[in-house]
Each structure stands twice: as structure tokens, then as C-alpha cells.
């Protein structure tokens, strides 16, 4: 720890002091530098400020002091391991007061109302006051008048000048003042009184359609005299006609783009094709936006979205009925569909394509398919701009013909009936099969009802004339081949109940 004693402090002048200290122990790592710090117990107690660093082979230095500071010094030795313990503090040296040597910086003038100007600045740090207190001499006059300056001395770091005209430029000076005098002659800053809303209406030059979902909007620069403030930029607002939200008739979703003041065009993208848009362009300043120039434009047609819900329905082992819904997003006037398909095992070769030139079409029958192949079907809706995104389905008649495994088949019973129901697989070829109910139990003697002919796509079958409280086996046959078996028991005797609504009976 370097020793620093009172006798080592020599006040050379009112603004210079010589500080000396004895070398610190280096602990086998040479001292690289000494840091001389000061504290002002009156203005910033327990806050130490560095006055400078000197090489490690020096044991004294001369320091420049500021007026009216209560200096208490200390010295810290620094080696490669870092700073050591600081020295004991010196006694306090108070420098005499003096006029300010600096003026405030960051002087600004701008209105927060239409008829005022608020002058602000960054206040001096206490170490630049040069006296117990500092004030500020604020001067202002309209720019270019060469007339007398108006002035006011204030303690706060701002001054509100009232009753100004709207957005007038002012010359502004702010000078530090204390009991010993004034600071140096300040620089002139240009400020402005309060802004008003712009009166300028941007004049649209035109709208260039870039594609079905983007436009370029251009306008002429506004007359700055009508901006009534600093032109900050342009607000571009646009919305689609008829874009009211479902749940709020009054609310229209509007999109906004802010364009910098030096730019007079903007590309609006992400628009919906084949739609009418409203557009507004407003100049804005610090106060707000001015009147809007209004315009309407329409985006051209684009390609449509993909058709909805493409289903394959087996007609025979060589034909399929394709059934679909139109796209949700037309993006224009639908003109029809394009259907393409190819066998899956031929790697995209042998692609066939049909133009379906009727936008009202919802079905198309494909014939001459191979019963042994699976196909990839691709359906696109078209507008005059061409085909859109495809909906794709894979299938064929082979997997869909023959009897299904009757997934999700179930049977329920009342007292004298039973309902057999199943979920037909999508695209499954319709076929006919037999359902046979066979009563079980000794006294029933295994009596069978006559087999009934049922269509697969009817989803359910109701068998009447069953005995109450009886176990039945249900047999499903196709072309004399046993396909499925299940069991059901009718309810005990009592009032006959009808089957649930919606079930087909035969």
C-alpha cells in the first residue's frame, strides 16, 4: 500500500496541486501504474473519480484542479494482478470559486404545443459548476430577425417560451452563470416552436400493379410549407373492400406502412388477388397526420387455391368417380379444373391429363383404369391465370373392390329387432352381400331367418321379427363366401321399441 501523507500535498496554484507518495510494496510483481483519485464529500460523498494514472516508477505528479471542489485524494498501486489497497486519504483541499468554464450541451428547442417552444439542455455536472450553485442564461429570438435577444435566467434545465407562432425557427443560446460570472459565449442552436397538424395532402402519381398480390404506390413529395412541422414521413393505410370481420360489422382490418420522409413510393405486398382495395396516404409530423389522399385499386386475378376434399368413389374395377369441392380461395373467376393422374409404380410416366372446362363441375368419372394399379390423382382449379395448387389423392379400384373387412361394424338390439351398422371405407367399391340372422339355444333349434341382400354403402341394416331375449349369430356372406360373424342378444319381453332414427331398413 503506497503511503500518502498530508505533507506530500503541495498547492502550487489555485488550480494545481502536487501529490507525492512513497512506493508501494510490489510483492514480486512490479508496479505498472498508480491511479490518483479524488472524492468531494460535499457534492458526491463516497464516490471516487480518477484524476489520472502515472507510470509505476513515478512517486509524484502534478494535478490540474477545478474551481470550487472539495478535494480529498488517495493513490492506488496497480500491478499485473490488479489494483492494491488504496492509500489512506489526504486532508481536504478546497479550490476557490470561479466563473463557469463550460456551457450546457445538447441544447434543443421544440414545441409540445402548437404555440410554444420548450428549450432543453443537458445540465452541467457539479464539478463544472465552479461555485456552490449554477444557473442558466437562456436567450432566444426568431431566426433571421437580427433583433434583440429575449432572455431569462433559470435554475431548471428547461424553459417554456409561450405565445409563439406555429412552427417558427428560433436561434437559441444557453450559457452557464454562477456567482463569479458567466461561462464562455455559447453557440447558437436552431429550435422550432410547436408543430400543428399537416395541411399537405400527398398527390398520388399512380399505382403500378406488380402482380396479383403486390402493387407499387407512388406520390409526389408534399409542399414542406404545408407540413406545419418537420416532415417525419408518410402513413400509408390500406384495406380490402368487404373485409369487415364476421363478429363486428363496424370493424375493418386495416394495414399500415410507415414510409420515411425522403421516400415517395412503397410496395404493398401480401394482397389478396382479384380484390378491391382502399388506399390512404397521409403526411405526418411530430404532431400527427394530415389529411389523406384516397385511392381505390383492384388486384388482378391470380391462380386459385387447391380444390377441397377430393374423394375417390369406386364405380367398378376399372372406373372411379372423383368428387371434390371448389377451392376456398378462388383468387379470380374459376374457369374449370385440370385433372392429371398416373400409375404409381411407373414413376410418374404415363401421366394423363384432362381439361375440365366447366367451373361448376364437382365430379368426374374416370374409366379404363387398370384394376391392378394404384394411381396418383392430382386436381387443380384454374382461373384465366392458370392452374393453382393441386390436391393429391392416391388410390385405385384394386384396393377398393371386393369385400371390405367391415371395420367398425357393430350390432345393437331391441326386443324384436337388431341394427347392424358399419362405416364404409372412403372409395370402397359398392357391393351387395347377404346378412343372415341365426337364433341360438335349444328351444330355438338354431332357426335361421331368410338371408337379406344388403348394399355396402347403405351403412346399416335393420332385421325385424326377432324373438325377444334370444341370442343370435349374425353371418355376413358375399358370393356364398362366409366373410364375417358376430353375436347379439335381443331384449326381454315388453313394449316394442323402434330402432334409432336414421337407420335404413330393407
Amino acid at each position: 500500500v503506497p503511503r500518502l501523507v498530508l505533507s506530500d500535498l503541495h498547492l502550487l496554484t489555485q488550480s494545481q496541486v502536487r501529490v507525492s507518495w512513497s512506493p508501494a510494496e510490489d510483492h514480486n510483481a512490479p508496479i505498472e501504474k498508480y491511479d490518483i483519485e479524488f472524492e468531494d464529500k460535499e457534492m458526491a460523498p463516497e464516490k471516487w473519480y480518477s484524476l489520472g494514472k502515472v507510470p509505476g516508477n513515478q512517486t509524484s505528479t502534478t494535478l490540474k484542479l477545478s474551481p470550487y471542489v472539495h478535494y480529498t485524494f488517495r493513490v492506488t498501486a496497480i500491478n499485473k494482478y490488479g489494483p492494491g489497497e488504496p492509500s489512506p486519504v489526504s486532508e481536504t483541499v478546497v479550490t476557490p470559486e470561479a466563473a463557469p468554464e463550460k456551457n450546457p450541451v445538447d441544447v434543443k428547442g421544440e414545441g409540445n404545443e402548437t404555440t410554444n417552444m420548450v428549450i432543453t439542455w443537458k445540465p452541467l455536472r457539479w464539478m463544472d459548476w465552479n461555485a456552490p450553485q449554477v444557473q442558466y442564461r437562456v436567450q432566444w429570438r426568431p431566426q433571421g430577425t437580427r433583433g434583440p435577444w429575449q432572455e431569462q435566467i433559470v435554475s431548471d434545465p428547461f424553459l417554456v417560451v409561450s405565445n409563439t407562432s406555429t412552427f417558427v425557427p428560433y436561434e437559441i443560446k444557453v450559457q452557464a452563470v454562477n456567482s463569479q460570472g458567466k461561462g464562455p459565449e455559447p453557440q447558437v442552436t436552431i429550435g422550432y416552436s410547436g408543430e400543428d397538424y399537416p395541411q399537405a395532402i400527398p398527390e398520388l402519381e399512380g399505382i403500378e400493379i406488380l402482380n396479383s398480390s403486390a402493387v407499387l404506390v407512388k406520390w409526389r413529395p408534399v409542399d414542406l410549407a404545408q407540413v406545419k412541422g418537420h416532415l417525419r414521413g408518410y402513413n400509408v393505410t390500406y384495406w380490402r373492400e368487404g373485409s369487415q370481420r364476421k363478429h363486428s360489422k363496424r370493424h375493418i382490418h386495416k394495414d399500415h406502412v410507415v414510409v420515411p420522409a425522403n421516400t415517395t413510393s412503397v410496395i404493398l405486398s401480401g394482397l389478396r388477388p382479384y380484390s378491391s382495395y382502399h388506399l390512404e396516404v397521409q403526411a405526418f409530423n411530430g404532431r400527427g397526420s394530415g389529411p389523406a389522399s384516397e385511392f381505390t385499386f383492384s388486384t388482378p386475378e391470380g391462380v386459385p387455391g387447391h380444390p377441397e376434399a377430393l374423394h375417390l368413389e369406386c364405380q367398378s374395377n376399372t372406373s372411379l368417380l372423383l368428387r371434390w369441392q371448389p377451392p376456398l380461395s378462388h383468387n379470380g373467376v374459376l374457369t374449370g379444373y385440370v385433372l392429371s393422374y398416373h400409375p404409381l409404380d411407373e414413376g410418374g410416366k404415363g401421366q394423363l391429363s384432362f381439361n375440365l372446362r366447366d367451373p361448376e363441375l364437382r365430379t368426374h368419372n374416370l374409366t379404363d383404369l387398370s384394376p391392378h394399379l394404384r394411381y396418383r390423382f392430382q386436381l387443380q382449379a384454374t382461373t384465366k391465370e392458370g392452374p393453382g395448387e393441386a390436391i393429391v389423392r392416391e388410390g385405385g379400384t384394386m384396393a377398393l373392390s371386393g369385400i371390405s373387412d367391415f371395420g367398425n361394424i357393430s350390432a345393437t338390439a331391441g326386443e324384436n329387432y337388431s341394427v347392424v351398422s358399419w362405416v364404409p371405407k372412403e372409395g370402397q367399391c359398392n357391393f351387395r352381400f347377404h346378412i343372415l340372422f341365426k337364433a341360438l339355444g335349444e328351444e330355438k333349434g338354431g332357426a335361421s331367418l331368410s338371408p337379406q341382400y344388403v348394399s355396402y354403402n347403405q351403412s346399416s341394416y335393420t332385421q325385424w321379427d326377432l324373438q325377444p331375449d334370444t341370442d343370435y349369430e349374425i353371418h355376413l356372406f358375399k358370393e356364398r363366401m362366409f366373410r364375417h360373424q358376430m353375436a347379439v342378444k335381443t331384449n326381454g319381453t315388453g313394449r316394442v321399441r323402434l330402432p334409432p332414427a336414421g337407420f335404413a331398413t330393407e
Epitope: 374457369t335 374449370g336 394423363l352 391429363s353 372446362r357 384454374t382
Partner: antibody, heavy 120, light 106 residues
């Protein structure tokens, strides 16, 4: 420049066949469906059928389906229309016409026409 | 097949006249197509999908209509417009053409 150039005029006897060619240039031949339309003297236009040069798929007007065959040769970008069992009322100008961009469905480019005269 | 009936079958008009040709389909169609044909020449497309101008067609031509009734309008007849005009539908195969409307010089 997109062009369809057809073969020259033909004079045929009743019962004979005629094969009219249509050579395409200035575009990708396989990307557009080719149609055949005929026009009897002083009459209107009548669609005969079309062919997709990409895979040779055809669609014929029921009126002609037993007598007409449409083919293409992609190596020469040429479409052909053959009409068999000619009758005197087959005397007409036969046009090939390209179907425009998908979704527009109109005949955007036509050949100059081939006059076929059927006379004994 | 859908039958197309054009009217009038012929008309006489002067340069500068507004000319309207109508086409009626025997059943509802989605779109109408219009072609212009001059003597000894192949037809030339004018209007597709009811109201869209084919490439290079002057803006004095316009098309409108829906369902079974469609119209071709020439706002100001020019000397080069004297020709025969055909409508065509394509709801389903076969596409069928109207009998034509001959526009002659008065």
C-alpha cells in the same frame, strides 16, 4: 412467333380418306392441346376433336368418332387429322387450332386452313 | 349438345357505329368465347371467358353476359371490323359455335 402451318388442299372421292397435317413452331408442342375445327362452304364452325400431344390422349365429337383419328408426331411437332369414309358433305376447310394457356380455354392460334373437296 | 343461336345473322352498320351482337345458349353455360373471321382467313380470337380481350385485340371490343345470354359489343366500328363474328361455348364437349353474324358496310 407462334405458327401453325397446314398441308395443302386435297380433292378426294367419296369413300376415300384424307390426312391433314399441321406443323407447329414457336412454342413447346407438347404443352398445348391441339384441336381440329372444320367449316363447310358458307357455313359456321364445327369442332371435330382434340389431342393432347403430351401423351396422345384424344377426345372426339360423337358425330365424327367412328371416322376420325387424330395423332401427333412430337419429333416434328406435327399434328395429324385423318377422316375416313369421306362424303360430299365433308367438303370443308379444316383448321387446326391450339388451345391457349390452361384455364383460358380458347383457341388462341389457328392454322391457315386446308380445303378438302369431296367430289365424284 | 348445347345449341348456340346468334342474332342478328347479319347487320349493316357505318364506321363509328356502336354494334351489339347477341348469342343465346340452349342451356346455361359458364363462359362465352368470340371469334372474328374475314373471308378466306382463319378465325381470330377476340374475347375469351366472356369478357377478357385476347392478345392484341383493341379495347373497343367488349363482352358480357351470363347464363344463357351473352353479348359482344363494338363501341365504335372501324373499317377493319367488317367481318363475320362467331360465339362459342365450352361447358362440355363438344364445344359448339353459333351460326355467325356478318357485319357489313352500310
Amino acid at each position: 412467333e407462334v405458327q401453325l402451318v397446314q398441308s395443302g388442299a386435297e380433292v378426294k372421292k367419296p369413300g376415300a380418306s384424307v390426312k391433314v397435317s399441321c406443323k407447329a413452331s414457336g412454342y413447346t408442342f407438347t404443352s398445348y392441346t391441339m384441336h381440329w375445327v372444320r367449316q363447310a362452304p358458307g357455313q359456321g364452325l364445327e369442332w371435330m376433336g382434340d389431342i393432347n400431344p403430351n401423351y396422345g390422349g384424344t377426345s372426339y365429337n360423337e358425330k365424327f368418332k367412328d371416322r376420325v383419328t387424330m395423332t401427333t408426331d412430337t419429333s416434328t411437332s406435327t399434328a395429324y387429322m385423318e377422316l375416313r369414309s369421306l362424303r360430299s358433305d365433308d367438303t370443308a376447310v379444316y383448321y387446326c387450332a391450339r388451345e391457349g394457356a390452361t384455364g383460358t380455354w380458347y383457341f388462341d392460334v389457328w392454322g391457315q386452313g386446308t380445303t378438302v373437296t369431296v367430289s365424284s | 349438345d348445347i345449341q348456340m343461336t346468334q342474332s342478328p345473322s347479319s347487320l349493316s352498320a357505318s364506321v363509328g357505329d356502336r354494334v351489339t351482337i347477341t348469342c343465346s345458349a340452349s342451356s346455361s353455360v359458364s363462359f362465352m368465347f368470340w371469334y372474328q373471321q374475314k373471308p378466306g382467313k382463319a378465325p381470330k380470337p377476340l374475347i375469351y371467358l366472356t369478357s377478357n380481350l385476347a392478345s392484341g385485340v383493341p379495347s373497343r371490343f367488349s363482352g358480357s353476359g351470363s347464363g344463357t345470354d351473352f353479348t359482344l359489343t363494338i363501341s365504335s366500328l372501324q373499317p377493319e371490323d367488317f367481318a363475320t363474328y362467331y360465339c362459342q361455348q365450352w361447358r362440355s364437349n363438344p364445344p359448339t359455335f353459333g351460326g355467325g353474324t356478318k357485319v357489313e358496310i352500310k
